[in-house]
Interface confidence: medium
Amino acid sequence: EAHKSEIAHRFKDLGEQHFKGLVLIAFSQYLQKCPYEEHIKLVQEVTDFAKTCVADENAENCDKSIHTLFGDKLCAIPKLRDNYGELADCCAKQEPERNECFLQHKDDNPNLPPFQRPEAEAMCTSFQENPTSFLGHYLHEVARRHPYFYAPELLYYAEKYNEVLTQCCTESDKAACLTPKLDAVKEKALVAAVRQRMKCSSMQRFGERAFKAWAVARMSQRFPNAEFAEITKLATDVTKINKECCHGDLLECADDRAELAKYMCENQATISSKLQACCDKPVLQKSQCLAEIEHDNIPADLPSIAADFVEDKEVCKNYAEAKDVFLGTFLYEYSRRHPDYSVSLLLRLAKKYEATLEKCCAEGDPPACYGTVLAEFQPLVEEPKNLVKTNCELYEKLGEYGFQNAVLVRYTQKAPQVSTPTLVEAARNLGRVGTKCCTLPEAQRLPCVEDYLSAILNRLCVLHEKTPVSEKVTKCCSGSLVERRPCFSALTVDETYVPKEFKAETFTFHSDICTLPDKEKQIKKQTALAELVKHKPKATEDQLKTVMGDFAQFVDKCCKAADKDNCFATEGPNLVARSKEALA
């Protein structure tokens, strides 16, 4: 229904706390370089204005769209051009073009330092002095680094953050309590960020229909007892919600997400038997819980999928009369039977089925032609199953760090033109798939591995799109979203690449490495490894092992030396010489 004042409507629906959080996220995602203090001032002004509209919906400007109101606020910032350059040109445009322009200027890799977690004592002090400001900083810092983070979910993580601090800051050993808990929240949030970026990429590149297909498959796996009409209602709603968030309509997105949670809880009987525990929670936790819900039990008496989609003599007639419904039903029926498949795989199978009908229904004997379609799925299913098997075996053999290194070598060989920091980030994230998925029960491994890898590779594509350097990466990234992971997996050593010349300074290290945290040390070593591969793309595994082993020993030895600087200065050149020799 239409409201006189959109902003008053959202303020009333969301409540002041969530409203302010969402406005802060919106501003931080649009203007990623502005300091917290500047954004919080704007947030307060918008909140005060919203309150005047709640009091009187006919008050001046209350009838303006939220995009207009937000855009006007952002464009009024002094020195906008100095700080943001061409983003300021957006301000010359009218809505909706102005908002589109802001969206196009979102930076997936902003030049911001990594978010450093303060020391436990300091963190607790500032949290206890002003919890609102502390959590505001958290929203701001995460949102500006992840401009597509799903806003209502970020509010949920802020709530988690709040819970952890409230609990741990009363403990005697604050650090021991905080570190593992905050690490867990951070890990979940980072995965959520890449997953949501993938959803926005899907929406931006391939439109709502592609996203809805993804949602139908996902919902059908989770809710196999819900009928198709129910699944498509949920998929349509989820598509709308994600479109809003990806488009910067964060207030509407959060409001609609809460509405969907309410609907699901009111209609549990026709959706899933697993929802009750989620439905007893407050709104943010309820939505999050529903998003992470375990799969319902598959109905016991499901007939073979072949009956309707291969054996029925009317297959081509049904397909011709209602393509979307017929293919949608196929995707639903196949997905509800296969919670053990990834969504990407299910969409590949649906695409294969569609291509088969397109071809066969135009031929003389369609049933003979499409009669083997289900058997033709086999290689498509085997390929990701083998990927999971070989990668999980490698992970179990090497551990996370060793597995990351193996992935780094592989991907540097596939795309040596890509910048080393991007390759290291991608390989570290891809390598985490082992820890995340390989320990799961067999039936959960494939969906976990492939859907996670797809999200990480989407991040690689997004970064590569900004500065394209590898034709192979461009080719994999330009194709269909569901074919990306197989495309990357199929890449081999890039034979067109001219090896980088050996630069001694790339492999020169100083005593500062000794005081780095383990993670930073690993990144330094992995940076060196990527550079080695760029120098010798065809180096054997043994050669790389020798050089990296030497390197690890060298760092270890010099970090234990009395005169560290001297050790690095004298031993370093020897290491470089030995490495060159080993790789010759």
């Epitope: 007892n225 009928e227 009409a229 498509t232 979307d324 419904v325 017929f326």
Partner: nanobody, 116 residues
Framework: QVQLVESGGGLVQPGGSLRLSCAGP????????MGWYRQAPGKERELVAF???????NYNDAVQGRFTISRDNSKNTLYLQMNSLRAEDTAVYYC??????????WGQGTLVTVSS
């Protein structure tokens, strides 16, 4: 548009029986809630009964105990068994589903007249 075709209507005496059939694509009948509606002359269209994919059924109070909705998946057909018919059951009966991504699908209707 999805095609649904009703049959089985006709003239019957009060207290008599009729069985209506609705033929449609099997994939649709199995995956969606299917329903029978009716529209008496000069009145609004009303729900008579529906059946979910799980087999769960639901009836309008006015027909409860007299009418039975069922489907035969092997024949891709939805049925409405109508017993103890009354004059007020006279109407055009429609088979219905709401396939997702599309407008509602209705059959062309079959006329049931209960009269002595």
């Amino acid at each position: 548009q999805v095609q649904l075709v009703e049959s089985g209507g006709g003239l019957v005496q009060p207290g008599g029986s009729l069985r209506l059939s609705c033929a449609g694509p099997g994939f649709l009948l199995r995956s969606n809630t299917m329903g029978w509606y009716r529209q008496a002359p000069g009145k609004e269209r009303e729900l008579v009964a529906f059946i979910r994919p799980s087999g769960l059924t639901n009836y309008n109070d006015a027909v409860q105990g007299r009418f039975t909705i069922s489907r035969d998946n092997s024949k891709n057909t939805l049925y409405l068994q109508m017993n103890s018919l009354r004059a007020e059951d006279t109407a055009v009966y429609y088979c219905h589903t709401r396939p997702p991504f599309q407008r509602d699908s209705w059959g062309q209707g079959t006329l049931v007249t209960v009269s002595s």
